[in-house]
């Protein structure tokens, strides 16, 4: 049979997902119901590996599968009839498959830094980069991330800095390729904690009796993480700035003369039965010298006529020595200290003085 050459196809339309493209086209020849179509699909920059698809007669659409996400392809469509008589020119169309979304990403806190490290494996296929969005309340930030390669299963990471401590952030990462955007991948991540900001003031200390005092102080600001505990520290020495080293000393050490500074009382804030909001400042009032015990610290009687100053340690993380049961490990804790109070001098023991006088 004799056939006239088919005219070229036109109006090629492409719809894509990540690994497939559905193509449709038109041919306006009267004889087009007798045509089949030959499709050549070529990945950009890889002409040696073209995929060929031949349709059944009269079919003007085809789906090509096993494509690579986020990649650029060119399709050429020839109309053909009879013994392979083809249209002179193919219809041509370039298209991109949709980029693949990131499967997931992990967040890691950076110890003592208001930052998060995001980690992910590269999604399959090609990408031009990623859109990263971070938000918390009214604050938000959008940045671009560089492209990655999925070939070797490498773990990619980026650090998100200039955040706030102990704050929950919504994080979204969107893959981009060929000007297309994948469905975003989301996670909610919370930044870590650090030492609390030291308070401006110092505790208020007042004598109650010849062997006890009352220490009043305001709760520390919780902007660097929730305050987990407070330690009340007493000294009879020179009131320099306290260090974490003093947290290991107890009333017993003080009595033995091993230290002029010691921890007399420990408050675990969780025991108050409610969480403290950032702006809420709680007031604390501690009776020092009442012979109570909190963990490894004994709140022993004070010395009549002694001169005492008080200081408060606030903890966002309190760690105890594994071997010294109930004693704070200052080096492993997140702690800051108030300044020492002014000194208070205790009165003499009136009963003892009276007793002494009669003998």
């Amino acid at each position: 049979a004799q056939y006239t050459r088919p005219s070229n196809v036109s109006n090629i339309d492409v719809s894509t997902n990540t690994t497939a493209a559905t193509l449709s086209w038109q041919n306006f020849d009267d004889a087009s119901p007798t045509y089949s179509y030959c499709l050549l699909i070529e990945k950009a920059g890889n002409s040696s590996n073209a995929t060929q698809v031949v349709t059944d007669i009269g079919i003007t659409d085809a789906t090509v599968t096993e494509l690579i996400p986020g990649s650029s392809y060119t399709v050429e469509i020839f109309a053909q009839v009879g013994d392979g008589i083809k249209s002179l020119e193919p219809g041509r169309k370039s298209f991109c498959t949709d980029p693949a979304s990131m499967a997931s990403f992990d967040c890691e806190v950076v110890p003592k830094e208001p930052a998060l490290v995001l980690k992910w494996t590269c999604p399959p296929g090609a990408n031009a980069g990623f859109e990263l969005e971070v938000s918390s309340g009214a604050w938000n930030n959008a940045t671009h991330l560089e492209s990655c390669s999925s070939e070797n299963g490498t773990e990619y990471r980026t650090e998100v800095t200039y955040l706030n401590f102990s704050t929950s952030y919504n994080i979204s990462i969107t893959t981009v390729s060929c000007g297309k955007m994948a469905a975003p991948t989301r996670n909610t991540c919370t930044t870590g904690i650090t030492d609390p900001p030291p308070p401006d003031g110092s505790p208020n200390i007042t004598s109650v009796s010849h062997n006890s005092v009352k220490v009043k102080f305001s709760g520390f600001e919780a902007s660097h993480g929730p305050i987990k505990a407070y330690a009340v520290i007493l000294t009879t020495g020179e009131a320099g700035h306290p260090s974490a080293d003093v947290l290991k000393y107890t009333y017993e050490d003080f009595k033995k003369g091993a230290s002029d500074t010691y921890v007399t009382y420990l408050i675990r804030t969780e025991e108050k039965g409610r969480s403290q909001s950032l702006s809420e400042v709680l007031k604390y009032e501690i009776d020092v010298g009442n012979e109570s015990t909190t963990l490894g610290y004994y709140n022993g009687k004070l010395e009549p006529l002694g001169s005492y100053r008080a200081c408060v340690a606030g903890f966002t993380n309190i760690t105890f020595h594994p071997q010294n049961k109930g004693l704070i490990d200052g080096a492993e804790s997140y702690v800051s200290f108030s300044r020492y109070s002014d000194a208070v001098s205790l009165p003499q023991d009136v009963a003892a003085a009276h007793h002494h006088h009669h003998h």
């Epitope: 671009h144 955007m181 975003p184």
Partner: antibody, heavy 117, light 107 residues
Framework: EVKLVESGGGLVQPGGSLKLSCAAS????????MAWVRQAPTKGLEWVAY????????YYRDSVKGRFTISRDNAKSTLYLQMDSLRSEDTATYYC??????????WGQGTLVTVSS | DIQMTQTPHSLSASLGETVSIECLAS??????LAWYQQKPGKSPQLLIS???PLHDGVPSRFSGSGSGTQYSLKIRNMQPEDEGVYYC?????????FGAGTKLELK
């Protein structure tokens, strides 16, 4: 085929308000960062506002901050620009665009906003 | 804010000629540089993003190059349909900013 169609432009007096819309089709609108770009008559292009996909965070150029509000309705595949306290210098053709990785990829045909008394 | 300085302001080229348009950013923009073509009464069309990948359907006679602060658009084998105004644009930092444009005419 990606299609963006702006509407809502017109003549408005200084101090007045206008709400522009951009109807999107041919792509998954909810995945895309979107933006408004304007072009004053016979002038160059100027980015106006930008909105992210997932969390819907908005960014504005300083000259429109506090006066313009960009928003989106993913269910309707529509982008909006609410323009209040309009000034004569806001007179321009306003285009909506997709904006992956900081490049304005697909553009609408534009809608003209004229601010004049 | 990042300023984009585009040169030349205008140029005319003969059919088949090669032309170059330069764009200088006031600070490094990490290749987040796009080029657009705009014809009278039409919307801008993206040609190149990320400094050099050609957008879908853009003829291969267009090419982009550059890094850091300096970028250029090259059009080989000038065609009548290449007439228009060309803009560069940085998408690295808000506010995203455009060059003032280069008007390309056929001689």
């Amino acid at each position: 085929e990606v299609k963006l169609v702006e509407s809502g432009g017109g003549l408005v007096q200084p101090g007045g308000s206008l709400k522009l819309s951009c109807a999107a089709s041919g792509f998954t609108f909810s995945n895309y960062y979107m933006a408004w770009v304007r072009q004053a008559p016979t002038k160059g292009l100027e980015w106006v506002a930008y909105i992210t996909n997932s969390l819907g965070s908005a960014y504005y150029r300083d000259s429109v901050k506090g006066r313009f509000t960009i928003s989106r309705d993913n269910a309707k595949s529509t982008l909006y620009l609410q323009m209040d306290s309009l000034r004569s210098e806001d007179t321009a053709t306003y285009y909506c665009s997709t904006v992956p990785l900081g490049a304005f990829v697909y553009w609408g045909q534009g809608t003209l906003v004229t601010v004049s008394s | 804010d990042i300023q984009m300085t585009q040169t030349p302001h205008s140029l005319s080229a003969s059919l088949g000629e090669t032309v170059s348009i330069e764009c200088l950013a006031s600070e490094g923009i990490s290749n987040y540089l796009a080029w657009y073509q705009q014809k009278p009464g039409k919307s801008p069309q993206l040609l190149i993003s990320h400094a050099n990948p050609l957008h879908d359907g853009v003829p291969s006679r267009f090419s982009g190059s550059g890094s850091g602060t300096q970028y250029s658009l090259k059009i080989r084998n000038m065609q009548p349909e290449d007439e228009g105004v060309y803009y560069c644009q940085q998408g690295y930092k808000f506010p995203y900013s455009f060059g003032a444009g280069t008007k390309l005419e056929l001689k």
